[in-house]
Interface confidence: low
């Protein structure tokens, strides 16, 4: 098995290497080729092993306060066989302590706040020193606290480091004190190491002063173009207190117009006068308001200092601004029937100059070839309108002051073109039909449908008929399906490709408009040589071959 004792290394050894101890297998008689290996944190860097003897050396100066023990693993291998002689084993190297660390106040800088005029015995702060030395090693880390500076106002408890008030203090005479505390290890015995810390003790304020305006009158100006929420100026009061006792809130005491507000900038303790409602120079060009200021936090027992709030008067002058024309409406919607002649009346827009001088207004339309506007705001057409080309027009009307052409306003004007029944229905697509020579009477040749470019007021309804000539002499007939479609049927039995290869049928389609419009549409029907089954495919193939110039027997 393994043979070893407890390993200790004194810290702060100045020798380049220090013999820690020896790892040995009891199978090692000194003549074996045993190779010892050291594994784990510190192996090969902090600790080196003589791989033949098992001697462990510390090659670095160790600091117990940095690391008090090293857990390492040992192996022993017979290098002639490469096999382990013993199972890998874990061992500990402990670093023994010396009193090489002075007490340190790790939490410094210390700063404490205590209310002024606090009674004797009031706890201020506890300072704690740490000694990195081993607390279980004698008195190396046992501490005593003492006061080096701070009498007669403060005292410190020797074993706890608690600082207390020993005499009342007045912030108005002195607002902060520096106290120096010493901590000694070895409970103060000879050879002790010491550390000191400074404690800044600040006396906190009590709220015995109210904020006061230094100015009894403020003069501010605001432009009539300023939006609501605009800051138009600042006012300021002063408070001899500090901290939150000097925090103040500004408010309006008098403002009949309810046009202004005051908000408080809590960083600068200024009052910011804010525009709550837009002002109009032409309506009112000056205002007078009264503001007051109070502390934000007032303790109940200190209310006697805050009975009457300080106030100030604020005169606000409104500056005139040349404003752009104002339209009566934010937008306009006009209607006009299609096909009305050019120069037809569409509608009237109206804008006025809100300023006192009431400049005349000129109107213009941005990029429109269809409409015109005159100086009275009357919009007329410059062309006849076709709803089927454009049902709506989005116009931009601009109003410009005659005396200041830079003052411009624009609004949208929407013109809806209303429908009139000016389009007859027509085939929805081009139809080309086929009929077999051996077709019987009543055979469906084609289903047709129609479309109408006009807008349907309720719903389009189309009426299908054959022309008078076709009705009288036609080999075909038409049935209106009453759903805007119709079917073409054969009106006889048998057709002859040689005699009549193509029929052109004129179909009348009427709409339900007022007045009703009718169109004539031609349906082409090819006669085909079909097989006995009357297969349409054969018919189509036959027709295709004919169209390509081939004759089929």
């Amino acid at each position: 098995g393994w043979v070893w004792n407890q390993f200790f290394v004194p810290e702060e050894m100045n020798t380049t290497s220090h013999h820690v101890g020896r790892l040995r297998s009891d199978l090692d008689n000194g003549n074996n080729s045993f190779q010892y290996k050291l594994l784990g944190a510190g192996a090969g860097s902090t600790f080196i092993i003589d791989e033949r003897t098992g001697d462990i050396y510390a090659i670095e100066k160790l600091d117990r306060e940095e690391r008090s023990l090293y857990i390492l693993r040992a192996q022993v291998i017979d290098i002639t066989t490469g096999r382990a002689v013993e199972p890998e084993s874990e061992f500990v190297i402990k670093v023994s302590d010396i009193n090489d660390n002075e007490p340190k106040f790790l939490d410094e800088p210390y700063e404490a706040i205590v209310p002024e005029m606090s009674p004797e015995g009031t706890l201020v702060i506890q300072v704690t020193a740490s000694d990195a030395d081993d607390p279980s090693s004698g008195n190396n880390a046992r501490l005593l606290y003492s006061l080096l500076q701070g009498q007669p106002y403060f005292s410190v408890e020797p074993t706890t480091g608690v600082i207390r008030i020993s005499s009342k203090m007045d912030r108005e005479l002195q607002d902060e004190y520096w106290v120096i505390i010493q901590a000694k290890d070895m409970i103060g015995q000879p050879g002790a190491l010491s550390g000191t810390t400074s404690v800044l003790i600040k006396l906190s304020d009590v709220n015995d002063n109210k904020p006061i305006f230094k100015e009894s009158l403020y003069r501010l100006t605001v432009s009539e173009s300023a939006p609501t929420g605009t800051s138009i100026g600042t006012i300021m009061a002063y408070d001899n207190d500090i901290g939150e006792n000097a925090e103040m809130d500004y408010s309006i005491e008098e403002d009949d117009s309810q046009t202004f507000d005051i908000i408080t900038n809590h960083e600068t303790q200024e009052g910011i006068v804010i525009l709550k409602k837009k002002v109009n120079f032409e309506h009112q060009n000056h205002y007078g308001i009264r503001a007051k200021v109070k502390n934000h936090h007032v303790d109940e027992q200190l209310m006697k200092y805050h009975t009457e709030a300080s106030t100030t008067f604020i005169k606000i002058q409104v500056e005139d601004v040349d404003e752009p024309p104002l339209f009566l409406l934010p937008y306009y919607i006009f209607e006009i029937f299609e096909e009305t002649p050019q120069g037809s009346f569409v509608g009237v827009v109206s804008a006025t100059d809100p300023d006192n001088r009431k400049s005349p207004i000129r109107y213009s339309i941005t990029r429109s070839k269809v409409f015109n506007i005159d100086d009275n705001g009357t919009i007329t057409t410059t062309n006849s309108l076709d709803r089927e080309i454009s049902a709506w027009y989005n116009l931009s009307i601009t109003a410009t002051e005659k005396y200041n052409i830079e003052q411009i306003s624009s609004i949208p004007v929407y013109v809806q073109v209303l429908n009139i029944n000016d389009h007859a229905p027509e085939f929805s697509q081009y139809y080309e039909s086929y009929v077999c020579e051996n077709a019987g009477s009543g055979q469906v040749i084609q289903t047709i449908s129609a479309v109408d470019r006009d807008e349907s007021i309720e719903e389009h309804h189309f009426y299908f008929n054959l022309s008078v000539e076709d009705t009288n002499s036609s080999s075909f007939t038409i049935i209106d399906n009453q759903d805007n479609t119709a079917v073409i049927l054969t009106n006889r039995t048998g057709f002859n490709l040689q005699e009549e290869p193509i029929f052109y049928i004129s179909i009348l389609i009427a709409d339900n408009g007022i007045p009703s419009l009718t169109s004539t549409n031609t349906l082409t029907i090819h006669v085909c040589d079909c097989d006995d089954s009357g297969s349409t495919q054969t018919c189509q193939y036959q027709e295709l071959m004919l169209s390509m110039g081939f004759k089929t027997e």
Epitope: Q35, G44, S45, I48, E51, R52, I79
Partner: antibody, heavy 120, light 108 residues
Framework: QVQLQESGPGLVKPSETLSLTCTVS????????WSWIRQPPGKGLEWIGY???????NYNPSLKSRVTMSVDTSKNQFSLKLSSVTAADTAVYYC??????????????WGQGTLVTVSS | EIVLTQSPGTLSLSPGERATLSCRAS???????LAWYQQKPGQAPRLLIF???SRATGIPDRFSGSGSGTDFTLTISRLEPEDFAVYHC?????????FGGGTKVEIK
């Protein structure tokens, strides 16, 4: 095959910190120990120390107080910092790969080396 | 640390001759833990031998290593023109790893 390339300033002022980076290409930095070796002009080689890919280090005691090594596996790079340099630190600095365990510590392959001159 | 002393400092030989380079350790080095390197001017060292006697990949068999304990030898059986260079020994059995001062093999 694995290739190593040193990079860094060729001139450093006395008392300043020498900083070099070795970029490994053609293979992963993981699983190996990576060493820095230097060679003053006309002199022998001196092992500065190694860094394992996981960040553990072992430095030559003669330089330990001034040496810091670091590794960035994501970039396949490892670095050397040597502080408070003097003219005695003027050398060609090489990076090299050790074995894949702590036992096999010959160096192969090596970077081509970079000359660092310490001068004001 | 283990100090490695290489001798001779310079070896002057002609191509085709045999070169014998010595590396002596200040304390015993396991034969498994010694390497030899070749270095040409302006180039990085190149591994020749590791474990005192094992040839690295791609190294011609004219290079051989031997020795144990404190005395190690690198032998170049027949010098080729490209073999003229500086040769370093290195021990890796103890930290810190150390190199010998080098032996320069030059053309006579």
């Amino acid at each position: 095959q694995v290739q190593l390339q040193e990079s860094g300033p060729g001139l450093v002022k006395p008392s300043e910190t020498l900083s070099l980076t070795c970029t490994v290409s053609g293979g992963s930095i993981s699983g190996y120990y990576w060493s820095w070796i230097r060679q003053p002009p006309g002199k022998g080689l001196e092992w500065i120390g190694y860094i394992y890919y996981i960040g553990s280090t072992n430095y030559n005691p003669s330089l330990k107080s001034r040496v810091t090594m670091s590794v960035d596996t994501s970039k396949n790079q490892f670095s050397l910092k040597l502080s408070s340099v003097t003219a005695a630190d003027t050398a060609v600095y090489y990076c090299a790969r050790d074995g894949s365990s702590g036992w096999y510590r010959w160096f192969d392959p090596w970077g081509q080396g970079t000359l660092v001159t310490v001068s004001s | 640390e283990i100090v490695l002393t290489q001798s001779p400092g310079t070896l002057s030989l002609s191509p085709g001759e045999r070169a014998t380079l010595s590396c002596r350790a200040s304390q015993s080095v396991s034969s498994s833990y010694l390497a030899w390197y070749q270095q040409k001017p302006g180039q990085a060292p190149r591994l020749l031998i590791f474990g005192a006697s094992s040839r690295a990949t791609g190294i011609p068999d004219r290079f051989s290593g031997s020795g144990s304990g404190t005395d190690f030898t690198l032998t170049i059986s027949r010098l080729e023109p490209e073999d003229f260079a500086v040769y370093h020994c290195q021990q890796y059995g103890n930290s810190p790893l150390t190199f010998g001062g080098g032996t320069k093999v030059e053309i006579k």
